[in-house]
């Protein structure tokens, strides 16, 4: 018996069909993804194959203007147009709260959201029950299919699920599960869920039972062959971990942002053993049609958008100091601003021991494209912040030694003068620079504010300490010569979309003021 | 290389069928599409129909309302077209074609030759 | 079922100048929408697919454009081997269509 596993993941609110590198459209001809060509695609194959599920790992909300708008119910509304037939819960479907998760998505959504490691406990477990699943079993042609769903348990410190709900072991909590699919004679085990590659791993070699395990959250590409666009695979499609009772087991994952869809074949035997996996994704590009009737609903739904790029998130009442002039040479108050936001952002209070689980943030001064002039009333749209940063990035969460952060403020400056974009705006630390020094030895001090602490203060760095650091993803990944982030860093969470982390501080603030405070000096 | 081989010209009576083959080589046969075309003399391109052989799965122009019966053979990778009560309008060359469904080439990639059939009392 | 119409029915134009064949979908077929190329006794083959996109192995003097309702096939400099039946094809819905055809010839 032969099933079509379709997965996506980590689409992150791209809706419509972005540029190569998943950014806004420039250029339609060379654009790619977007859900009216998506659904071309999955239409095709349901049309070509006779047993297919379209499945989704999680991270749907987040990501573009349109999960700022809409809140979730474009999630709910074009995966329902699509026909996805279940999904698992990622971190970032708590970004609103649970609330913000429960109305727009779960009491909307025609197909299971799953995940058998998050317990409701409190109030919220009978408002929640029934909402999302542990797992389902679904019919595919004269067959049963068991999908089971599972969440990264750090989700409490990467988004907002609030108090009333617990995030267990993965494997801890799918094995009993799976056990019981096995029960109701349910012998093809899909596990679906968002804990990243490793994890995915993990589960593949331990938890009995399971024989296809579709993941997300990190954003892992696989291939076989030559891959079609600028991804580097991290492994073939699909990659096979055998597990410890000696199965053969398939592990996929289809990148992120819409780009591909997963397409993994399954061959069954009577007794639900798998024979053979073999696929590859697919590159939603251009030469894929966008289907006409759901890129007509697209277009409505957009509307929407353009209004709310031009009206008042809030105002400021100083310049907004954007320019290159001074963010690449100098602490500028933009800098100090978006710095602010993101740490604000992250604020989770999950410890008594700590007042919160990150204080420090940096951001290299070239991301910030432009000033907003407080002369025009003060207003500050969307529209103003995405010419402040328009590269559609993240804000992401990662975890450093001090020897590497020493390291990337040593690189802030090795060639300090020269307008290039790496100079380092930063919150939560001090740093001073002496330039008359040579490259590489020019930091003379480094603090970093407290976490585990009572009363914020600032702490010489530590070389051997582990530290959590806000950054954009485009340092994450080692851009702006920032390798040694990329090389070193021991963790990386995927965070919320950069407009959307300043728009909601400007917002929530309603005036802001950001000073030139002494964060970066020079001796 | 990717082939479609056709089976030879064929002379029916009306009211009769004909049953007109496809070999399939080069290729993964379970993983395309096969359509059916015909041309009638000096005319243009008409769509009876596709088959997809990994799952049998079957679509046909309403045009030919039940007369048309497309069906494959994995172990000999040959699709088939079958139709049904012929008239002398159903003289024509009847062409398979191939369709990548997972690639992003939309259209007939892969051409046979051609089968003629002359459809005469 | 969706109808494709093609103009002109025929053509003809001067070696090495630019030919241009229309072709006109009577709903929206996106950019689902392939070009073929028919020489006298032989099948058609695929010269351009998704509107746009040249099929490997075809001479760049082909380019397609279009996408919605109206397409576009041009020949930038007509070549003697191009004379030809062109036909286009909507790739978006079943029963899927072809145009008329059109007879390219030299002047």
């Known amino acids: 018996w032969e099933l079509t596993i379709l997965h996506t993941n980590d689409v992150h609110s791209r809706l419509e069909q972005t540029s190569e590198d998943s950014s806004k459209c420039v250029n339609a001809s060379r654009c790619m993804g977007g859900v009216a060509r998506l659904f071309t695609k999955v239409q095709q194959i349901r049309r070509a194959e006779p047993n297919v599920l379209l499945l989704d790992a999680g991270d749907q909300y987040q990501g573009t203007i349109w999960f700022t708008v809409y809140k979730g119910a474009e999630v709910a509304h074009f995966m329902n147009a699509l026909r996805y037939d279940a999904m698992a819960l990622g971190n970032h479907e708590f970004d609103n709260g649970v609330e913000g998760l429960i109305e727009p998505l779960l009491k909307e959504a025609k197909f299971p959201i799953l995940s058998a490691n998050i317990k409701a406990k409190g109030p919220l477990a009978s408002q929640i029950s029934g909402l999302y699943l542990p797992y389902k079993v679904l019919p595919v042609g004269d067959e049963v299919v068991g999908i089971v769903g599972y969440t990264s348990k750090e989700t409490p410190f990467l988004s907002n699920p609030g108090t009333n709900l617990v995030f267990e072991d993965e494997i801890t909590a799918l094995q009993p599960e799976v056990d019981k699919l096995k029960t109701l004679n349910v012998n093809k085990i899909i596990a679906l869920g968002h804990s990243g590659f490793e994890m995915d791993k993990l589960i593949a070699q331990k938890v009995r039972g399971v024989d296809v395990v579709v993941g997300g959250h990190s954003n892992t590409f696989l291939y076989t062959g030559n891959p079609p666009s600028k991804e580097v695979p991290a492994g073939k499609y699909p990659f096979i971990v055998t597990s410890d009772d000696g199965r053969k087991v398939p592990v996929v994952q289809a990148y992120a942002f819409g780009k591909y869809l997963g397409y993994l074949k399954i061959e069954f035997d009577e007794r639900g053993n798998v024979i053979s996996s073999h696929g590859n994704p697919i590159l939603l590009n251009s030469s894929i049609p966008e289907d006409p009737s759901i890129k007509a609903d697209i277009n409505k739904w957009r509307i929407k958008l353009d209004n709310y790029s031009t009206q008042e998130l809030g105002k400021t009442i100083v310049y907004l100091d954007g320019s290159s002039q001074s963010c690449r040479f100098r602490e500028c108050n933009m800098g100090n601003l978006i710095c602010d936001a993101m740490i604000n952002n992250n604020l989770r209070h999950t410890d008594e021991m700590f007042w919160n689980h990150v204080s420090m943030c940096i951001l290299n001064g070239g991301g910030i494209r432009s000033p907003i002039d407080e002369r025009n009333n003060g207003t500050i749209t969307w529209e103003n912040l995405a010419a402040v940063l328009p590269f559609g990035g993240t804000f992401d969460l990662v975890q450093l030694k001090g020897s590497t952060l020493k390291k990337a403020f040593e690189h802030s400056v090795h060639r300090y003068g020269q307008s290039t974009g790496e100079f380092l705006q930063v919150g939560g630390i001090h740093v001073v620079y002496d330039l008359s020094r040579k490259p590489g030895d020019r930091v003379v001090k480094l603090d970093v504010l407290c976490t585990k602490c009572r009363v914020p203060s600032y702490d010489p760095l530590k070389m051997d300490e582990v530290y959590k650091v806000i950054l954009p993803n485009f340092l994450a990944n080692g851009g702006d010569g920032f390798q040694m982030i990329k090389d070193e860093l021991l963790r990386h969470d995927s965070g919320d979309q950069d407009i959307n982390v300043v728009s909601t501080y400007i917002s929530k603030m309603k005036v802001i003021y950001p000073a030139v405070e002494g964060r970066i000096k020079f001796s | 290389q990717v082939q479609l081989v056709q089976s030879g010209a064929e002379v029916k009576k009306p009211g009769s069928s004909v049953k007109v083959s496809c070999k399939a080589s080069g290729y993964t046969f379970t993983s395309y599409g096969l359509s059916w075309v015909r041309q009638a003399p000096g005319q243009g391109l008409e769509w009876m129909g596709e088959?997809?052989?990994?799952?049998?799965?079957?679509y046909y122009n309403e045009k030919f309302k039940g007369r048309v019966t497309i069906t494959a053979d994995e172990s000999t990778s040959t699709a088939y077209m079958e139709l049904s009560s012929l008239r002398s309008e159903d003289t024509a060359v009847y062409y398979c074609?191939?369709?990548?469904?997972?690639?992003?080439?939309?259209?007939?990639?892969?051409w046979g030759a051609g089968t003629t059939v002359t459809v005469s009392s | 079922d969706i109808v494709m119409t093609q103009s002109p029915d025929s053509l003809a134009v001067s070696l090495g100048e630019r030919a241009t064949i229309n072709c006109k979908a009577s709903q929206d077929v996106s950019t689902a929408v392939a070009w073929y190329q028919q020489k006298p006794g032989q099948p058609p083959k695929l010269l351009i697919y998704?509107?746009?996109y040249r099929y490997s192995g075809v001479p760049d003097r082909f380019s397609g454009s279009g996408s919605g309702t109206d397409f576009t096939l041009t020949i930038s400099s007509l070549q003697a081997e191009d004379v030809a039946v062109y036909y286009c094809q909507q790739h978006y819905n079943t029963p899927y269509t072809f145009g008329g055809g059109t007879k390219l010839e030299i002047k």
């Open positions: 998704s509107a746009s």
């Open positions: 074609a191939r369709y990548d469904y997972l690639g992003s080439s939309y259209g007939f990639d892969y």
């Open positions: 088959i997809y052989p990994g799952s049998g799965n079957t």
